[in-house]
């Protein structure tokens, strides 16, 4: 079942899903000057069975100035450079997040996609929080939130994280030290956005992997 609301907002923190449960929707959004093709997919869907999950549907964007011309979904080299996916992260391949039964990994970018990714999570989804650059984490408990179903309604658990204004970045669970982004991009201070940056993450599977976080809005 879809979660009604967004994960909680923590001041000066961002959140990220390490893997997406089946039923998760990712809206097909296009960057400024481009639009979803008229009969194109509305969203990508994490779908599959207990042994294998993948993203169904393809997002396609077309120039809003040009009629009836569709852009291919293969990312261009400059976009690949700008938006690193897990596959391009390092010589050592990370554990496939889709190997967590019933979960999909971060979907690859499509050409001219929007700067924000809008996900719609399902019950049981877990997201992890970290403080944005320039803030330090004070943990009172797990820095994560889970969408749960209680009495027929969905709710997100409250992450036990406070970000204080000290010039020291915090880490995701199990992370020793965050790595600097190759592009040197600063993280967003908007609490509901997750910006492009690289760091090591310990997943629910207790596998450490490098991942790239796209600018994301969850709404």
């Amino acid at each position: 079942e879809l979660c009604d609301d967004d994960p909680p907002e923590i001041p000066h923190a961002t959140f990220k899903a390490m893997a997406y449960k089946e039923g998760t929707m990712l809206n097909c959004e296009c960057k400024r000057g481009f639009r979803r093709i008229k009969s194109g997919s509305l969203y990508m869907l994490c779908t599959g069975n207990s042994s294998h999950s993948s993203w169904d549907n393809q997002c396609q964007c077309t120039s809003s100035a040009t009629r009836n011309t569709t852009k291919q979904v293969t990312p261009q080299p400059e976009e690949q450079k700008e938006r690193k996916t897990t596959e391009m992260q390092s010589p050592m391949q990370p554990v496939d997040q889709a190997s967590l039964p019933g979960h999909c990994r971060e979907p690859p970018p499509w050409e001219n996609e929007a700067t924000e990714r809008i996900y719609h999570f399902v019950v049981g989804q877990m997201v992890y929080y970290q403080c944005v650059q320039g803030y330090r984490a004070l943990h009172r408990g797990p820095a994560e939130s889970v969408c749960k179903m209680t009495h027929g309604k969905t709710r997100w658990t409250q992450p036990q994280l406070i970000c204080t204004g000290e010039m020291e970045t915090s880490q995701f669970p199990g992370e020793e030290k965050p790595q600097a982004s190759p592009e040197g991009r600063p993280e967003s201070e908007t609490s509901c956005l997750v910006t492009t940056t690289d760091f090591q993450i310990q997943t629910e599977m207790a596998a450490t992997m490098e991942t790239s976080i796209f600018t994301t809005e969850y709404q």
Partner: antibody, heavy 114, light 107 residues
Framework: HVQLQQSGAELVRPGTSVKISCKAS????????LGWVKQRPGHGLEWIGD????????NYNEKFKGKATLTADTSSSTAYMQLSSLTSEDSAVYFC???????WGQGTSLTVSS | DIVMTQSQKFMSTSVGDRVSVTCKAS??????VAWYQQKPGQSPKALIY???YRYSGVPDRFTGSGSGTDFTLTISNVQSEDLAEYFC?????????FGGGTKLEMK
């Protein structure tokens, strides 16, 4: 929570125009396609078209081109549908609906009568 | 335009029964199908997206299935509050189209 609040019932004369509004709340209005649906007894549900407020992009069902005009005001998170050259065939309940994940307004009843 | 056909306009059922509402698309729509429930005087309420996934707050007695051209909404252990009209909708290609509806009635 996502809410779509539509304007009240309308009774109008044939040949005139009407503008129905749909005020969105509980989500980022500019980030979602918002559609309009017509419902008439015996005719089921018909998709009129949809608009992406973030860019003002629109899609129209060919059947409603020239009849419906979709607009959006991002400052008030309100979408509008104007229906022109009204006839009795336009008498129906009109719904606005966020395209995905789906969420519908309560509907606006339009009666075209002389 | 893609035609969505709900061959049964009415279906009779009793509380506790299991009932299946069917919908057939005139061409392949993948799994891009939604199901809605509409009660008199109300707006349609979304039950299912992508043929088989439930929206939040939808009881698990509602199950969607199918892909391609044939789709089914199954209501197991029918409750009195389930008496309503049910519509399928395809959003695989534009314009998005709806089935004619199936009204669930009490025997």
């Amino acid at each position: 929570h996502v809410q779509l609040q539509q304007s009240g019932a309308e009774l109008v004369r044939p040949g005139t125009s009407v503008k129905i509004s749909c005020k969105a709340s509980g989500y980022t209005f500019t980030n979602y396609w918002l559609g309009w649906v017509k419902q008439r007894p015996g005719h089921g549900l018909e998709w009129i078209g949809d608009i992406y407020p973030g860019g003002g992009y629109t899609n129209y069902n060919e059947k409603f081109k020239g009849k419906a005009t979709l607009t959006a005001d991002t400052s008030s998170s309100t979408a509008y549908m104007q229906l022109s050259s009204l006839t009795s065939e336009d008498s129906a309940v009109y719904f606005c609906a966020r395209v995905t994940p789906a969420s519908w307004g309560q509907g606006t009843s339009l009666t075209v009568s002389s | 335009d893609i035609v969505m056909t709900q061959s049964q306009k009415f279906m009779s059922t009793s509380v506790g029964d299991r009932v299946s509402v069917t919908c057939k698309a005139s061409q392949n729509v993948g799994t891009n199908v939604a199901w809605y429930q509409q009660k008199p005087g109300q707006s349609p309420k979304a039950l299912i997206y992508s043929a088989s996934y439930r929206y939040s707050g939808v009881p698990d007695r509602f199950t969607g299935s199918g892909s391609g051209t044939d789709f089914t909404l199954t209501i197991s252990n029918v409750q009195s509050e389930d008496l309503a009209e049910y519509f399928c909708q395809q959003y695989n290609s534009y314009p998005y189209t709806f089935g004619g509806g199936t009204k669930l009635e009490m025997k």
